[in-house]
Each structure stands twice: as structure tokens, then as C-alpha cells.
């Protein structure tokens, strides 16, 4: 399924999205625009992030050691020191008990820049993607994933951290954005809306999708997340939009069927390992890419975002389960956990395919307005 309601091969949101909520001026790049950490009151879309060390919880990664030799990912240090590593864990994003990172929330106080000054940076995420303005970069090759088909053991930690549902990934999941751009997956988490209200973080020509998955990766150039934060390319996130389809998605069901067990904020359960790549679109060759930030405090910049052109289909029931099962802080439902789109401020989104060439009949003479900046490095 490619992006929204378009012909088979048209780019993400290639044509008019049909939404009655066109991009506002604040979504356009402008010198004065400072990023919003939340939507203006009254807007239906709430803002937010998670608690990676920005994209939910980030971990500390160490290379395979003699002792249980695998990446050790502990929580990012945003607020507290990492918890004790157990053995070979990926603790990558390990939300500590007590979770002191949670003095931020979607909407309302405190303003995110007060939680982390980086949230007021100029190159923040998420953003609105306009395929017509994307720069076609033939040097952007298909993504390569290795080790994403996990055996059922060891089981993985699935946690409601109050901001999202997060699956901590074990060592050994390798991803390459291209030659010499190698990463290790740390965790994945989701963003969603509420009944009848979409909740993806990125948008396409102003169109917001029902939900969005983020798989967070650490560059192999860094041993720990805290070393990579804020460094260009230190972290990379693969993002895909989730849409409603006619059939149940069996890969997602392995996680969604366990959400009731972690309905309460701070609760967690263990789930059998699964094929993580099955949670992503099958087409690894068509995507958008730009440099942005974590979408939750600490909002560290330098994050390489790769947003798939193809969407993932879940049944209506599954999308309802996702948005209606978990509880967040203060007896409130965990819903609308997305941050408002942030201004590009001159950034150019690159596409691995000619996204500006809209195959729909309405695009008379499509012009690629931006040229590829990175020749593949």
C-alpha cells in the first residue's frame, strides 16, 4: 500500500490529500519560524514526543563484550543515569522505574524547550512532506536490514512508558542507509491518535495518517546513545505510516494482542521475538529522507529520518486497539501522542525515487523543484 489514497505508484500523498486541513503557513520554512512544541490550543492534533532519549527511551550501546557479548543499551541519560545493565541486554531504551523523564507531556506545560532547550532548535521533527518539493536522489539506494527476523527467544520487553508503547530490541539488528552508513536498531515505538482522529507524526501534504511506527537506530560509529545525541547521523529512525486496510496484520497482532497486559502506565510484559521487518513496508527502495530531531524531549538534532513511501495496513479493529487500550499519566488515556509538524527552515527533503513526478492525471507538467544535495554520502 503506498501513501495516501493515491494510484498504485504515485508518491506518498502524491496528489491532493483531500483533507480539509491544508498546511498552515506555520508549516512552511521561514526564518522567523521557531518550531512549536505543541499545537495551538483548539487544534485537534495534539503534539508530542516520546521518551526516547527523545524518541522514546534510548539506550546505551556497547559492542559485543566477553560478557554475554552483545550490545548493551541502557537508557539515555536524559534525566537519570542508566539503570544497572543486566546481562546481554539491549537495554537500549530502558525506561527506568520512576521514569523521571516524564516531566514532559503532549500538550500543555511545561513547554518542551524548558524540558530540553534543543526542542527549540531550527531543524526539528516531525515535518510535513511535500513530494513535489522533494529532491530526487538516485544515490539513495534501497535500505538494507539484517537480523530483523528475530527468533522467539529471547523474549522482548514491551512497555507502556506513558508516552508510547515501546519494544526494546536485542543486539544484532543491523541497518544500512547506504555504504558506510551503518546502524544498529535499538527500539521501536508507535504514535497514534484517537477514535476518528489520526495520529501520525509526519504528514504528507498536510495529510495525517492514523498512526506511525518508528524504529530507532544508533550509528555503529558510536558505542552509546548519549555520545550520538546531537551528532549528525548519530541516530537514524525508520518511519512508516500505518493505514486502515481490510485485513488483520498478523505481524502487528503479535504486539497489539498484548497491549491489555500493559494498559497501565509504566507496566511492561515480555513478548516472543518476531520478524521486526514485517512491521515495516515491503518496499525498502522508495522513501523520503531528511535530517531532523527526536520528536520527544530531548529533541536532539542530527537524526536521519527515513520515511517510507509505502504504508503498512492494519485492520480497523487493530487501529482501534492501538488507540484505545493504553493509559498514560494521571488517569488519562494514552492517545494523540504525536508532536506537531515543525518548520523545515530551509531543509530539503530528499527522495530515493522521483516523487515530484506525480503519475496522477492532475499533475500536468511536474517539476522537480529541488535537486539532490547529498550525492549519496
Amino acid at each position: 500500500q503506498r501513501l495516501p489514497r493515491m494510484q498504485e505508484d504515485s508518491p506518498l500523498g502524491g496528489g491532493s490529500s483531500g483533507e480539509d486541513d491544508p498546511l498552515g503557513e506555520e508549516d512552511l520554512p521561514s526564518e522567523e519560524d521557531s518550531p512549536r512544541e505543541e499545537d495551538p490550543p483548539g487544534e485537534e492534533d495534539l503534539p508530542g514526543e516520546e521518551d526516547l532519549p527523545g524518541e522514546e527511551d534510548l539506550p546505551e550501546v556497547k559492542p559485543k563484550s566477553e560478557e554475554e557479548g552483545s550490545l548493551k543499551l541502557e537508557d539515555l541519560p536524559t534525566v537519570e543515569a542508566p539503570g544497572d545493565p543486566q546481562e546481554p541486554q539491549n537495554n537500549a531504551h530502558r525506561d527506568k522505574e520512576g521514569d523521571d523523564q516524564s516531566h514532559w507531556r503532549y500538550g500543555g506545560d511545561p513547554p518542551w524547550p524548558r524540558v530540553s532547550p534543543a526542542c527549540a532548535g531550527r531543524f526539528q521533527s516531525p515535518v510535513d512532506i511535500r513530494p513535489q518539493l522533494a529532491a530526487f536522489c538516485p544515490a539513495l539506494r534501497p535500505l538494507e536490514l539484517l537480523g530483523f527476523q528475530l527468533p522467539p527467544l529471547p523474549e522482548l520487553r514491551l512497555r507502556n512508558n506513558g508516552h508510547s508503547v515501546q519494544l526494546t530490541l536485542p543486539p544484532g539488528l543491523e541497518m544500512a542507509l547506504g555504504p558506510g552508513r551503518e546502524y544498529r536498531a535499538l527500539q521501536l515505538h508507535l504514535h497514534w491518535g484517537a477514535a476518528g482522529r489520526p495520529g501520525s507524526e509526519h504528514t504528507v501534504e498536510g495529510h495525517r495518517f492514523p498512526a506511525e511506527i518508528h524504529v530507532v537506530h544508533l550509528s555503529t560509529a558510536f558505542a552509546r546513545v548519549d555520545e550520538a545525541l546531537g551528532r549528525p547521523g548519530g541516530l537514524a529512525v525508520l518511519a512508516a505510516f500505518l493505514e486502515e486496510g481490510p485485513e488483520e496484520n498478523s505481524a502487528y497482532e503479535q504486539l497489539l494482542s498484548r497491549l491489555e497486559e500493559i494498559a497501565e502506565e509504566g507496566s511492561e510484559t515480555q513478548v516472543p521475538g518476531l520478524d521486526i521487518s514485517a512491521l515495516l513496508p515491503s518496499d525498502f527502495s522508495r522513501y523520503f529522507q531528511y535530517e531532523g530531531s527526536l520528536t520527544t524531549p530531548p529533541c536532539a538534532q542530527g537524526v536521519i529520518w527515513t520515511v517510507f513511501n509505502q504504508t503498512v495496513m492494519l485492520s480497523a479493529k487493530q487501529l482501534h486497539t492501538l488507540s484505545d487500550t493504553l493509559w498514560g499519566p494521571g488517569d488519562s488515556r494514552l492517545q494523540l501522542n504525536f508532536r506537531a509538524t515543525q518548520p523545515l527552515n530551509g531543509r530539503v527533503i530528499e527522495a530515493s525515487f522521483p516523487a515530484g513526478v506525480d503519475s496522477s492525471p492532475r499533475a500536468a507538467e511536474p517539476v522537480q523543484l529541488n535537486s539532490c544535495l547529498a550525492a549519496g554520502d
Epitope: K64, E68, S70, Q86, E87, P88, Q89, P152, P154, P171
Partner: antibody, heavy 122, light 111 residues
Framework: QVQLVQSGGGLVQPGGSLRLSCAAS????????MSWVRQAPGKGLEWVSA????????YYADSVKGRFTISRDNSKNTLYLQMNSLRAEDTAVYYC???????????????WGKGTLVTVSS | QSVLTQPPSVSGAPGQRVTISCTGS?????????VHWYQQLPGTAPKLLIY???NRPSGVPDRFSGSKSGTSASLAITGLQAEDEADYYC???????????FGGGTKLAVL
């Protein structure tokens, strides 16, 4: 020291049942997945079943699915294999093995019991 | 027929080097799953020899080493000794079978 002590093997008729036990000591039993592996006389090793540390998730080889049940009692540090509808081809030495920790299978099956012989014959 | 294929037997004289191959497919070794090696001396339980492709547990002599490439793995034994005479098994996970799998085993004879 880390060890696994097995019991429960013996001679049983085809169609019969048997329960194997594996008592663990020297490590935090509930933190590790456990596995059963068998070896028919003169043959190689065959994985039979595995169970997560909590006991919530269980896995079986196709050859025993529906007939064997793996379970554990973490309060007793003991792993079990309930074998029903036994067949002649189930005749083997059965080994229990400590496998994955709660976060990694990196170390393989690093501790094995001495094995217990199950003979299915009329 | 095992999913992981090993030679039924290998042999070598004391002091020599032998290798035992373990050939799999894209659904097991080639999918990136770790390969572990076990040694089974006559009449005893298997013992972990190499874990995660190329790591030795404490107590295993450095004469034993493992490697993995593509859809195959191999175990190398240098400075062969009489006490190395045993059966050797490789083990991994297979995503198609959704099962942990062993090679058929290789009998090492020290001449």
C-alpha cells in the same frame, strides 16, 4: 555451581505417558529460558521444546507438537516435559539445557543435564 | 535429513588442523542467526564449545575456533589431540521452520 539434575526416564509402552523433570541450581532459574533436546540411539541431537523464563511462552518441534508439554515451576527451580501418546520413534536420551537469558540467546545452550533415557517399546 | 548439513566424519593426525563445516540456508545461518557448536564426548552429554559464531566459553582451549560467512559456519581445531575425538554439532535457529535446529553431527577421529 551451575547444574541441571534430570529424572523421570524409563520404559513405557507405545501410547503411554511419562514426565521428565530437570532440577536447576546455581543460577537464577526464572531468568532463563530452558530447552529439551533429545538424541535417539546412534543418532544426532534434535531440539524438542523450549520455554521462556516466565513460563508464559512455549515452543515445540513439529514432531512432538500436540503430544508433549513443556512447563516449569520457578518456585521449585524445576523444568518439566510431559510426554503423552508416546511412539517408538520418541525413544531417545532426553537432555534439558539452560538456554537464553531474559535478554539474550548469545551464549547458546551453555549448561546441559546428564540426560535421561526414555524407551518406548511394547 | 538435517536442516544444517555437516560432514558425517573428519579425521586428522595428532597436531594437525581440521575443520568441520556447517552449511545452512537463507532461513537460518544466512538470515544472521548465531551458530553455536557443541562437543559430545562418547557416553556424555553435549558441552558448549563455541557460542555466537566465534566465541569460546571459559575453559575451552584456544585450539578451537569458529567462523561464519554467508549461509555457512565452520569449526576449526588446531593442534589435534586424542581427547578431541568426539561428535561435534552446530546449532542455529530456522525462521521457516520456526524451530531451533542442529546439524547432523560430525564424528572426529584422531588417527
Amino acid at each position: 555451581q551451575v547444574q541441571l539434575v534430570q529424572s523421570g526416564g524409563g520404559l513405557v509402552q507405545p501410547g503411554g505417558s511419562l514426565r521428565l523433570s530437570c532440577a536447576a541450581s546455581g543460577f537464577t532459574f526464572s531468568s532463563y529460558a530452558m530447552s529439551w533436546v533429545r538424541q535417539a540411539p546412534g543418532k544426532g541431537l534434535e531440539w524438542v521444546s523450549a520455554i521462556s523464563g516466565s513460563g508464559v511462552s512455549t515452543y515445540y518441534a513439529d514432531s512432538v507438537k500436540g503430544r508433549f508439554t513443556i512447563s516449569r515451576d520457578n518456585s521449585k527451580n524445576t523444568l518439566y516435559l510431559q510426554m503423552n501418546s508416546l511412539r517408538a520413534e520418541d525413544t531417545a536420551v532426553y537432555y534439558c539445557a539452560k538456554y537464553c537469558s531474559s535478554t539474550s540467546c548469545y551464549r547458546g545452550m551453555d549448561v546441559w543435564g546428564k540426560g535421561t533415557l526414555v524407551t518406548v517399546s511394547s | 535429513q538435517s536442516v544444517l548439513t555437516q560432514p558425517p566424519s573428519v579425521s586428522g593426525a595428532p597436531g594437525q588442523r581440521v575443520t568441520i563445516s556447517c552449511t545452512g540456508s537463507s532461513s537460518n545461518i544466512g538470515a544472521g542467526y548465531d551458530v553455536h557448536w557443541y562437543q559430545q564426548l562418547p557416553g556424555t552429554a553435549p558441552k558448549l564449545l563455541i557460542y555466537a559464531n566465534n566465541n569460546r566459553p571459559s575453559g575451552v582451549p584456544d585450539r578451537f575456533s569458529g567462523s561464519k560467512s554467508g549461509t555457512s559456519a565452520s569449526l576449526a581445531i588446531t593442534g589435534l589431540q586424542a581427547e578431541d575425538e568426539a561428535d561435534y554439532y552446530c546449532q542455529s535457529y530456522d525462521s521457516s521452520l520456526r524451530a531451533w535446529v542442529f546439524g547432523g553431527g560430525t564424528k572426529l577421529a584422531v588417527l
